[in-house]
């Protein structure tokens, strides 16, 4: 049967049952995915918008597939095996009474079973297996997969030690707390920080511990994935996004028409084919563009490059370089430079690094 041909898998809860608190639903579904990630190399991440690999739906009766639900009792839920579109999706019958405990139908236990199907498992003939076709409550605090469940899922995906550091060739969502995580581009947008990676961005609201992941296409459908550089001019409510030799202008979070435009309109020489990173400093009203081991400085008021550039990054940003992945400006005195999985807090008044951090330190990892 089909399997997911990647190890980073996204899920989204389309809607919530009124039988439970939203937080309890989130928790039950998260723990159900964790049951399977604990015994495989699979990593699951919840997204809140856009197309997830696995869509979790609560519905009653006819609900958009050939398998209408049958009211209370009988069929509790069903899930589709891995694949595109409806593939992987898990549907829960809203006519059941979903609970966190032994009364009604326990959502966590049902979700573990259905996610097994979403990952490609069929039913088991072992009555102790969670993949046994009939529902039976067991104490969720001591719940464990049976040997048969583990054998089944590991025959599809291997054990957790396999491929622990997979590259991300399929553009699936990277694990946020992976210590090796790097970013393609980072910028502030008002009081938020956007972290771009592949087709995703994480949104960090300043001073709040929570972050959410989204597809770039869910916010800006006309933009490509793989944004390589970004900067904000907050006073104008403008964000500039760069990929290859093109850039897009976002005003008040809306893409402007007649974009993308060529980066050469900024005055770059023809040999510049892409921008690695960019940051606007409102104190000087200048934007710094980082390309390979060099940087240019652009006067946003006069709309032209300052003379005397490019310059070497290592020469003018002590301890930074020779190349960087991303940079953003914060707190009126710092640039945060990203190089691979490392991040450097750089005081541009003192002109030195004041702190070395992991790139994902903003996420409470």
């Amino acid at each position: 049967g089909p399997v997911w041909r990647k190890h980073y898998i996204t899920y989204r809860i389309n809607n919530y049952t009124p039988d439970m608190n939203r937080e309890d639903v989130d928790y039950a579904i998260r723990k159900a995915f964790q049951v399977w990630s604990n015994v495989t190399p699979l990593k699951f991440s919840k997204i809140n918008t856009g197309m997830a690999d696995i869509l979790v739906v609560f519905a009653r009766g006819a609900h958009g597939d050939f398998h209408a639900f049958d009211g209370k009792g009988g069929i509790l839920a069903h899930a589709f095996g891995p694949g595109s579109g409806i593939g992987g999706d898990a549907h829960f019958d809203e006519d059941e009474f979903w609970t966190t405990h032994s009364g009604g139908t326990n959502l966590f236990l049902t979700a573990v079973h259905e996610i097994g199907h979403s990952l490609g498992l069929g039913h088991s003939s072992d009555p102790k297996a969670v993949m046994f076709p009939t529902y039976k409550y067991v104490d969720i605090n001591t719940f464990r997969l049976s040997a048969d469940d583990i054998r089944g899922i590991q025959s599809l995906y291997g054990d957790p030690k396999e491929n622990q550091r997979l590259p991300n060739p399929d553009n699936s969502e990277p694990a946020l707390c992976d210590p090796n995580l790097s970013f393609d581009a980072v910028t502030t947008v008002g009081n938020k920080i956007f972290f771009f990676k592949d087709r995703f961005f994480w949104l960090k609201v300043s001073e709040r511990p929570k972050t959410s992941v989204n597809l770039i296409s869910s916010l800006w459908p006309t933009l490509p994935s793989g944004i390589e550089a970004a900067y904000e001019i907050e006073a104008r409510n403008q964000v500039f996004l760069f990929k290859d030799d093109k850039y897009w202008l976002i005003s008040n979070l809306r893409p402007e028409p007649n974009y993308p435009k060529s980066i050469h309109s900024f005055g770059f020489p023809n040999f510049v084919k892409k921008i690695d990173a960019a940051v606007f400093n409102p104190r000087f009203y200048r934007t710094y563009f980082f390309v390979d081991n060099q940087y240019w400085r652009y006067d946003e008021r006069r709309q032209m490059m300052d003379p005397g550039y490019p310059k070497l990054i290592t020469k003018n940003f002590q301890g930074i370089g020779p190349k960087i992945d991303a940079v953003f400006y914060s707190k009126n005195k710092y640039y945060y430079f990203f190089q691979g999985s490392n991040q450097f807090e750089y005081d541009f008044l003192l002109q030195r690094i004041t702190k070395t951090l992991k790139s994902n330190s903003w996420f409470g990892c």
Epitope: G1, N14, M51, L55, V57, H63, G64, D65, F66, H67, H78, A79, F80, G81, G83, S84, G85, I86, G87, D89, H117, G122
Partner: antibody, heavy 122, light 103 residues
């Protein structure tokens, strides 16, 4: 190359019976749901019936329930539609269609046959 | 029961035009919507699945969007071979079809 070839259509009187066949090749037939979809002359598409990969589950449109029976023979890579108590409104081109899924039907038909015409008339 | 309403039922356009066909469900069908193209005397062909995914081999001038109850098929620049009938579909329910004709 995936191929679906329907046969068995023809002229039949109201109340009569007909059995359609669909010979499948170019894919592992026993892995997929299969469906029948029909199209009355000059009209739109109407889903008729579907059958799970193993043959154990069948589903029907209300308009044919109790009169039509879908079946399959995985050893012969063939899908069937037995049509009884035929009515004038069953006149249509009948297409066999392959689903992209096996355990639960996605309702997504990625390959279709060319169709066979069934005419119910006295 | 779920019903699908497709509009318009017919449409006249010229080569190079941008054309939009809509499909509306009477309840949420998430992104479980497919689009097919049918030419006279031929079987339908899958164009778009899961609301917005382009079936392999289908030209990129075709695109789909929408989720929940409202869906759109767009042809960005009509080509002569695009004049056909288009159907939206969700499980066992097809829209009534939109016949796209040359103006």
């Amino acid at each position: 190359e995936v191929q679906l070839l329907e046969s068995g259509g023809g002229l039949v009187q109201p109340g009569g019976s007909l059995r359609l066949s669909c010979a499948a090749s170019g894919f592992t037939f026993s892995w997929y749901w299969m469906h029948w979809v029909r199209q009355a002359p000059g009209k739109g598409l109407e889903w008729v019936s579907g059958i799970v990969s193993s043959g154990g589950t069948t589903i029907y449109a209300d308009s044919v329930k109790g009169r039509f029976t879908i079946s399959r023979d995985n050893s012969k890579n063939t899908l069937y539609l037995q049509m009884n108590s035929l009515r004038a409104e069953d006149t249509a081109v009948y297409y066999c269609a392959k689903d992209i899924r096996g355990a639960y039907s996605s309702g997504l038909f990625d390959y279709w046959g060319r169709g066979t015409l069934v005419t119910v008339s006295s | 029961d779920i019903q699908m309403t497709q509009s318009p039922s017919s449409l006249s356009a010229s080569v190079g035009d941008r054309v939009t066909i809509t499909c509306r469900a009477n309840q949420s069908i998430y992104t479980y919507l497919n689009w097919y193209q049918q030419k006279p005397g031929k079987a339908p062909e899958l164009l778009i699945y899961a609301a917005s995914s382009l079936q392999s081999g289908v030209p990129s001038r075709f695109s789909g969007s929408g989720s929940g109850t409202d869906f759109t098929l767009t042809i960005s620049s009509l080509q002569p071979e695009d004049f056909a009938t288009y159907y939206c579909q969700q499980a066992g329910i097809f829209g009534q079809g939109t016949k796209l004709e040359i103006k």
